[in-house]
Interface confidence: low
């Protein structure tokens, strides 16, 4: 019968920082130079041997004279309590098939980490422990005096634990959060009654969880250096040098080379000239608590990020075409580049792609004359597109061309004794049609009754009108816009010898917020179109004169413009244009885009005051210059009489007082006799005009006292 191989020489050492017990032992009676498979059962007790807190088996192959090692980590700091360890063994080897049995237990080995030294009566453990956010942590206090009441606080909030013995209480902190990089404060305070006996604190360093680097990528711009970048995520550095920021290491598996990166989010890798094409990089992030890694495998030629093109130029620039040229940094022989061109101008953007070798060239056509363009180019590897380079760009301006459209021309004709005064207006050509800076306008006046007679007036830009005094003949007027290159087509207008101001009734119209909707009867005979012109009724016609051309088959239009202001009256005239370009006035219209209430009240005179009546008149009140069509007047009258006069009706004023009101519906009726009055009586009146938008402003009443019957005024 074999002797059981009892473990002997059990020694237990501790590592306070790791909270671990390290066991060492040997097995006597092992056959010399023989290996045996054995199982060791380990028992760990806390505070007293009977309080077994952990039992486990450890299997290993044992050699003669071998010192065996095994470690165990305690969730409770070792300083908190005495631990006891013992061990027994069992042979579990095929060489000994007969039933085996456990050896005796070794004697208990007592382990005590004494950090509760000195005169202090209270201790808190562990000190300065480093853990990761979300882990569970056990802390404890050791109190010398069991009469003391001890309270513990985590960041100022009281925590409650489990008493292990009269001196020791442990606290389980579940899933500890990161609070600050200078650590989480835990305090315990011992007191008897209301008297504090002392306080102890520890700092628990909670690290944020190290993240896997994101967006890891490498690329080259010259086949000499690989530039690798990544998003490092949260910095896990802690204060008091407890944990520095995580480090990053690049490892390339094909070459077996490794590089510690000095930056937190990028690293350069020297490409050796040994024609290595495929790279397998592992980026390792590491702090004191864990490692994280991410991998990329790529072919070097598929990761080319070119430097941006240079020497961008424009050649043979004319009014509508240009040649764009550029260079790219050559990085390898026989390299083909794909380049993208963007052309910005006149609010539009065009895009073109072109394949090149070293020097790029692109013909830009269908450009607008006299226009500033911004062209830019970027390039990439055409064979294995990885990503575009940065843009390189330049501005250029096309040359001018002759104006492409005739100016839009209209006129006002006023008859004076013996002649016509023609005020000619034209609109500036749009940028699209001016094709450059308009320098001057040529106005050619030709007398159609005397064909050989014509005059040329050259008017410098930016003038947009001119006044011509013509006799009672028919005239053809041409207006031509000129820039540095040439002249536009001519705009032709004919002034008839016949007076055109035949009596045409003016019609009132109502506008809307959107403008004015106009319609008219078609002109008999052939027309080439209609013209609607308009201006502010109250102003000098030259100040705010506008017109609109309408096609020959249209007899209505909407005039909408932001220039229409509420309370302003506009006059419209509608002309038909004959095939001979002679204008004929068809209709006149006037109205407000939005009527407002009158801006002022009339100045009222009191006439023929008698004991029974008086006359009110406001003859000088102008109805024309008002912010709406005056529809009539309201006459308000106050007196001590309880009843209103005949023709008047009761009304309530805005201040709540009562009075009598009379309505005049004719805006030209500017007098009223107020009669049936009482002698020696006190009256008050107030007259205000009204439009569709309301009355004029409130004003004070004017006082009138009728004389006695015997007086004469």
């Amino acid at each position: 019968e074999r002797l059981p191989l009892t473990p002997v020489s059990l020694k237990v050492s501790t590592n306070s920082t790791r909270q671990s017990l390290h066991l060492q032992w040997t097995v006597h009676n092992l056959p010399y130079h023989q290996e045996l498979k054995m199982v060791f059962q380990i028992q760990i007790s806390r505070i007293e041997t009977s309080n077994v807190i952990w039992v486990g088996n450890y299997s290993t192959t044992v050699k003669w004279n071998q010192v065996l090692h095994w470690s165990w980590e305690s969730e409770l700091p070792l300083e908190c309590a005495t631990h006891f360890v013992r061990i027994k063994s069992l042979v579990d080897d095929a060489k000994f098939p007969e039933p085996n049995f456990w050896s005796n237990w070794s004697s208990w080995e007592e382990v005590s980490v004494q950090d509760s030294t000195g005169q202090d009566i209270l201790f808190v453990f562990p000190k300065d422990k480093l853990v990761e956010e979300g882990t569970n942590v056990t802390i404890c206090y050791v109190s010398r005096n069991i009469q003391n009441n001890v309270s513990c606080y985590l960041e100022g909030k009281q925590i409650h634990g489990e008493q292990l013995d009269p001196h020791v209480t442990a606290f389980n902190l579940n899933s500890v959060p990161f609070i600050r990089n200078k650590g989480t404060n835990i305090y315990c305070e011992a007191s008897q009654g209301n008297v504090s006996e002392g306080m102890k604190g520890i700092v628990l360093f909670v690290s944020k969880v190290l993240e896997e680097p994101k967006d890891f990528s490498c690329e080259t711009e010259d086949f000499k250096t690989l530039h690798c970048t990544w998003d490092p995520g949260t910095d896990t550095a802690l204060g008091w040098s407890k944990q520095p920021s995580q480090s990053y290491t690049l490892f390339e598996s094909f070459s077996g080379e490794k590089k510690l990166c000095t930056h937190k989010n990028w690293c350069n890798w020297q490409i050796t000239q040994d024609s290595q094409e495929t790279y397998n990089f592992t980026l390792i992030a590491e702090n004191y608590l864990r490692k994280r890694s991410v991998n990329i495998l790529f072919n070097l030629t598929h990761r080319v990020y070119l430097m941006n093109p240079f020497s961008v130029n424009f050649e043979n620039v004319n009014a509508t075409n240009a040649i764009m040229t550029w260079k790219v940094h050559s990085i390898r022989n026989n390299f083909t580049y794909l380049c993208q061109i963007e052309l910005h101008g006149e609010g539009k953007m065009m895009q073109y792609n072109v394949s090149i070798k070293v020097n790029g060239e692109y013909f830009l056509s269908e450009l607008e004359p006299a226009t500033e363009y911004m062209a830019r180019v970027r390039c990439a590897d055409a064979s294995h597109f990885w990503k575009w380079s940065e843009w390189s760009g330049q501005n250029f301006t096309t040359l001018e061309a002759a104006p492409s459209e005739a100016p839009d021309v209209w006129r006002i004709v006023s008859l004076e004794p013996g002649n016509h005064t023609v005020t000619l207006f034209w609109k500036p050509l749009s940028k699209l049609h001016a094709n450059g800076k308009i320098l001057f306008y040529n106005v050619v006046v030709e007398n159609l009754d005397k064909p050989s007679s014509s005059e040329l007036h050259s008017i410098p830009a930016p003038a947009n009108s001119t006044k011509l005094i013509l006799d009672r003949c028919s005239y053809q007027i041409c207006v031509i816009a000129n820039n540095s290159v040439g002249a536009s087509p001519a705009s032709v207008i004919v002034i008839s010898a016949d007076p055109e101001n035949k009596e045409v009734e003016e019609e009132r119209i109502a506008g809307t917020e959107g403008g004015f909707s106009l319609s008219w009867k078609p002109q008999p005979g052939d027309v080439i179109g209609y013209v609607v012109d308009w201006c502010d009724h109250t102003q000098d016609v030259l100040g705010d004169f506008q017109w609109k051309n309408v096609g020959p088959n249209t007899t209505s239009t909407v005039i909408s413009t932001d220039a229409f202001r509420p309370g302003v009256r506009y006059d419209f005239r509608i002309y038909g244009l004959s095939t001979k370009r002679i204008a004929c006035l068809l209709e006149k219209k006037t109205g407000y885009s939005q009527e407002l209430a009158p801006s002022d009240n009339p100045h009222v005179l009191v006439d023929t005051l008698t004991s029974h009546s008086f006359t009110l008149s406001w003859k000088d009140y102008s109805t024309e210059s008002q912010p709406g069509f005056i529809q009539g007047y309201h006459v308000y009258l106050k007196s001590k009489a309880r009843q209103c006069h005949p023709r008047f009706e009761k009304a309530v004023l805005s201040d709540g007082s009562e009075c009598c009101k009379y309505k005049i519906d004719n805006p030209e009726e500017k007098a009223l006799i107020v009669d049936n009055l009482k002698p020696e009586s006190f009256y008050e009146f107030f007259i205000t005009p009204f439009t569709s938008a309301g009355e004029g402003p409130s004003a004070t009443f004017t006082k009138v006292t009728t004389p006695d019957e015997h007086s004469s005024m």
């Epitope: 100022g156 200078k182 404060n185 305090y187 305070e189 306080m199 604190g201």
Partner: antibody, heavy 118, light 111 residues
Amino acid sequence: QVQLVQSGAEVKKPGASVKVSCKASGYTFTSYYMHWVRQAPGQGLEWMGIINPSGGSTSYAQKFQGRVTMTRDTSTSTVYMELSSLRSEDTAVYYCARGTTYDAFDIWGQGTTVSVSS
Amino acid sequence: QSALTQPPSASGTPGQRVTISCSGSSSNIGSNTVNWYQQLPGTAPKLLIYSNNQRPSGVPDRFSGSKSGTSASLAISGLQSEDEADYYCAAWDDSLNGLYVFGTGTKVTVL
């Protein structure tokens, strides 16, 4: 080194306003709260309010609500305290103090004397 | 705003131990940490003790703080002439209108 430098002494009439500045240096301005504390002659310390230089949010002691405005300019690392409708009892030394995450005022300005009299 | 209550004065001879009390309520000292400030004549206050009993660097270890329930105390052991100053306790108050409250202040005289 870390320091808070306050603007100079002010003499004001009742009903007027005063604006005191406090320029921080030697640390990351937006990482610490700033408090304002005042001390009337021969009296104790009185807390007025707090500003978070990062977002600019403020909280004032109820006693000063409606009269005090605390602002900051991150480009110059400066906080300001404006007290309006001054009365004679506002005569005091006004301190700015840096507030730590553990609620203590670890760095104090040198103080600005504000005198209010007609 | 209700301040924390401190004795107006305390005194001792050089080398003696002096203790200053600070009384509050459940809404301030009872539920928050206590800080102590020293104000030498004509100067700005200086942080002496924070979080009930923690000393900032540079503060001699003869100064110690403690807290129990709704009261706190500051002890100066081995009193020295340069300790003659005003001492203030302080804490956040969690009442409806949260604010930072200071003690009424204690004048320490070295005899």
